[in-house]
Amino acid sequence: QQQTLPKPFIWAEPHFMVPKEKQVTICCQGNYGAVEYQLHFEGSLFAVDRPKPPERINKVQFYIPDMNSRMAGQYSCIYRVGELWSEPSNLLDLVVTEMYDTPTLSVHPGPEVISGEKVTFYCRLDTATSMFLLLKEGRSSHVQRGYGKVQAEFPLGPVTTAHRGTYRCFGSYNNHAWSFPSEPVKLLVTGDIENTSLAPEDPTFPADTWGTYLLTTETGLQKDHALWDHTAQNLLR
């Protein structure tokens, strides 16, 4: 006899990286007929939704209207059908950004390189942080962690055209509190035809929406975002 229901799916809209004082929605998708959803934050009950009518709803939304460092951390959700509870969802790491200062991102030998050349990014922030994160716009899984007193090195090694794209970095005050994003650095690799359209193998943020980390929220893509957001979050842990 089944003792628990399948785990629900959890994700954040518009994104798991939330600028401070901005709104974010945590979505939890379970099964039709679920009479109760619970959202847990850092292991404690945070919110409860009992959708009506339950047979017509399989997703609930928990709003956080004003993101701050107290609300940043690990969230999970569960749901109940009758008396039977689900397994807990994967952990969602909610990160608050735009904290304190703005790092500087530079690239050596330069932003235009030849395929096969060794490239290193440098992220510098003069305030009290020792962890840095380099993100390539596009797939959220392109996150690298680096350490240093005021600067971290991110060696990419010999680059290929797959490394092309726009990079930003953050200083991290803890796993869930990040600085403002750096100004973007666009890496061009010889042979690359500049293309700003969404490529299926590497979906990208439109350049003008990066500042607020907006993602397209078409229903069909929400799960995909959560999947690759989750990959990025694994790097945070």
């Epitope: 934050f41 939304q61 709003y63 956080i64």
Partner: nanobody, 130 residues
Framework: EVQLVESGGGLVQPGGSLRLSCAAS????????MAWFRQAPGKDREFVAA????????YYADSMKGRFTISRDNSKNTAYLQMNSLRAEDTAVYYC???????????????????????WGQGTLVTVSS
């Protein structure tokens, strides 16, 4: 901006009842989930009960279930906490709280964590003693 003012606290004997009120100012009150919390001397703040903006969903801390009832009257911009079968351990300052007012909350959602609440009253003291 929402302002909250609690009333109805006082001294009551064990087994007695009290009804706390939380009057809110601000046009958005009727769309905000609310809750009651309490803090006993020398202890951490503790969740008591929560209610959705519609009043259709409620949630209680286990130790209050069956004894306390949370309700609201949006036409009066007021929330209530009816407390029955009071015990000495219910002695505390009781606070009402409302969430931030910039989001379209589900009519059935309640928040149980103090960190979710942006607006707080000044509290009303409930003393249960013979």
């Amino acid at each position: 901006e929402v302002q909250l003012v609690e009333s109805g606290g006082g001294l009551v004997q064990p087994g007695g009842s009290l009804r706390l009120s939380c009057a809110a100012s601000g046009r958005t009150f009727s769309r905000l989930p609310m809750a009651w919390f309490r803090q006993a001397p020398g202890k951490d703040r503790e969740f008591v009960a929560a209610i959705s903006w519609s009043g259709g969903s409620t949630y209680y801390a286990d130790s209050m279930k069956g004894r306390f009832t949370i309700s609201r009257d949006n036409s009066k911009n007021t929330a209530y906490l009816q407390m029955n079968s009071l015990r000495a351990e219910d002695t505390a300052v009781y606070y009402c709280a409302a969430v931030g007012d910039s989001a379209p909350y589900s009519a059935t959602i309640v928040y149980t964590d103090a960190r979710a609440y942006a607006y707080w009253g000044q509290g009303t003291l409930v003393t249960v003693s013979s």
